[in-house]
């Protein structure tokens, strides 16, 4: 009774197509698969950024797999062949592992890479990234930003840099068609006559860095003798009403401060007849139904009612 063995896949490699972190893992079938012609061979692929605690594991029948990685670190991957039990009249057979690594050879001391990179997708319409130059770099150092997301043929360079003292310190992006809900990859590299500059890689999803415009058209309506309804409208732009959370800050007679978080464009406030002044402001943020994270908008303009019977008047700013 001969033991069934299978070879690992051949030519296992990680290929960088120049997409700033979106890499291809590819391989060829193992040698001597002739005995298993009737079998569908599977492959178990494990991969991770070097330094990560956990491996991602994929089982596939294909000869390739694609995923995003952090190119600030190296990547390690391993793969083996799986023969299902149907092929072996018994238990599943696994080959030994084939292993490979990939990294971008760095240049420059880490301090030379950009500092405090910050990207905001204003009102789900305009992406703006800003950074500070690396520590100790001279004014002849210039940084260049490249970006890619699925749908672009190749990585693109920023065409509208924000400058300070002749140095690029940010990028205003053009309209980014069909760019949300997918990984957005950025590389900021640099050059200097004086010394080599370390590149930095960043990955995020645009819907998670949205900063909306503040709400508009704040109004008061007396609902009853002890209730006032506060209302406002969503700001202009592409963000639908269902995507907003709001935070309200209400000040009564310059003393009581009420803060509340609500999911729609109204809030009912209990008041007393003695209330002489009422002011409120609202800000908005994309909610968990539309993103994993977000940035609060600026506060709206303040809307106040002062010294008049709210039952007789509705204020509209």
């Amino acid at each position: 009774d001969t033991e069934i063995k299978v070879n690992p896949p051949q030519d296992f490699e990680i290929v960088d197509p120049g997409y700033l972190g979106y890499l291809y893992l590819q391989w060829q079938p193992p040698l001597s698969l002739d005995h298993f012609k009737e079998c569908t061979v599977e492959y178990e692929l494990k991969y991770r950024n070097i330094g990560s605690e956990t491996w991602k594991t994929i089982i596939t029948k294909n000869l390739h797999y694609k995923d995003g990685f952090d190119l600030n670190k190296g990547i390690e991957a391993k793969i083996h062949t799986l023969l299902p039990w149907q092929c072996t009249n018994g238990s599943e057979v696994q080959s030994s592992w084939a292993e490979t690594t990939y990294w971008i050879s760095p240049q420059g001391i880490p301090e030379t890479k950009v500092q405090d990179m910050d990207c905001v997708y204003y009102n789900w319409q305009y992406l703006l990234c800003s950074w500070k130059p690396g520590i100790g770099v001279l004014l002849d150092t210039n940084y260049n930003l490249f970006y890619w997301y699925e749908g672009l043929d190749h990585a693109l360079q920023c065409v509208d840099y924000i400058k300070a003292d002749g140095q690029n310190i940010g990028c205003r992006f053009p309209y980014l068609e069909a760019s949300d809900y997918k990984d957005f990859y950025i590389c900021v590299n640099g050059s200097s006559e004086n010394k080599p500059i370390r590149s930095s890689y960043f990955t995020f999803q645009l819907q998670n860095i949205v900063k909306p415009l503040p709400p508009v058209y704040l109004t008061f309506t007396r609902e009853s003798s002890c209730e006032i309804k506060l209302k406002w409208s969503i700001p202009l732009g592409p963000i639908p009403a269902r995507c907003f959370d709001y935070e309200i800050e209400i000040r009564e007679d310059d003393t009581t401060l009420v803060t509340a978080t609500v999911e729609n464009e109204t809030y009912t406030l209990k008041t007393t007849n003695e209330t002489r002044q009422l002011c409120f402001v609202v800000r908005s943020k994309v909610n968990i139904y539309c993103s994993d994270d977000g940035i609060w908008s600026e506060w709206s303009d303040k809307q106040c009612w002062e010294g008049e019977d709210l039952s007789k008047k509705t204020l509209l700013r």
Epitope: S105, P106, Q107, I109, P110, E111, G136, P196
Partner: antibody
Framework: EVKLEESGPGLVAPSQSLSIACTVS????????IHWVRQPPGKNLEWLGV???????NYNSALMSRLSIIKDNSKSQVFLKMNSLQTVDTAMYYC??????????WGQGTTLTVSS | DIVLTQTPAIMSASLGERVTMTCTAS???????LHWYQQKPGSSPKLWIY???NLASGVPLRFSGSGSGTSYSLTISSMEAEDAATYYC?????????FGAGTKLELK
């Protein structure tokens, strides 16, 4: 197996120049940077400089005017060149491989004595 | 330059004893770029702990590292004879790259 091996003149007269070679095997100089570090007898380690995989260099500013690091990828060799040597340059000189911002392999070192 | 101050300069420990040595930086260093090397007499340094807390290949699990900002430490949970050596901390964050003056650990 990764190996780095330094070779130098051993003894150099003051005010002279020196060249120390670091010959590597088991990896490619097109994928890893090489650092130079020295250690005077019984003293601290001092970083001299690095030549990156792409060929660019960084030097310790305190020694920059006297230092130069070059390499020959095809021969797997890196050279540290240093001029105007003084007795304070007497030290063990090491080359070390850069791997993800640390020195993961070191050579055994070569002793340099600056003396008349 | 970032100055790394190691304390104590020399220490001795008995077999099985817990050992801790510290490395204080003159300005903040990212934990990704703070490493420890072990050196024995007549040998070149060896990478021992990288990025503050990751053990290099072949380093016994009794070693550990921790810290952030300007304060870092290396700990041996139970001293063994082969641990007697000098340990250097090293910052790779800013140029020039610098090393501490070392902590010499002797067997009592």
């Amino acid at each position: 197996e990764v190996k780095l091996e330094e070779s130098g003149p051993g003894l150099v007269a003051p005010s002279q120049s020196l060249s120390i070679a670091c010959t590597v095997s088991g990896f490619s100089l097109t994928r890893h940077g090489i650092h130079w570090v020295r250690q005077p007898p019984g003293k601290n380690l001092e970083w001299l400089g690095v030549i990156w995989a792409g060929g660019s260099t960084n030097y310790n500013s305190a020694l920059m005017s006297r230092l130069s690091i070059i390499k020959d990828n095809s021969k797997s060799q890196v050279f540290l060149k240093m001029n105007s040597l003084q007795t304070v340059d007497t030290a063990m000189y090491y080359c070390a491989r850069d791997h993800f911002d640390s020195f993961d392999y070191w050579g055994q070192g070569t002793t340099l004595t600056v003396s008349s | 330059d970032i100055v790394l101050t190691q304390t104590p300069a020399i220490m001795s420990a008995s077999l099985g004893e817990r050992v801790t040595m510290t490395c204080t930086a003159s300005s903040s260093v990212s934990s990704s770029y703070l490493h420890w090397y072990q050196q024995k007499p007549g040998s070149s340094p060896k990478l021992w702990i990288y990025s503050t807390s990751n053990l290099a290949s072949g380093v016994p699990l009794r070693f550990s590292g921790s810290g952030s900002g300007t304060s870092y430490s290396l700990t041996i949970s139970s001293m063994e004879a082969e641990d007697a050596a000098t340990y250097y901390c090293h910052q790779y964050h800013r140029s020039p790259l610098t090393f501490g003056a070392g902590t010499k650990l002797e067997l009592k």
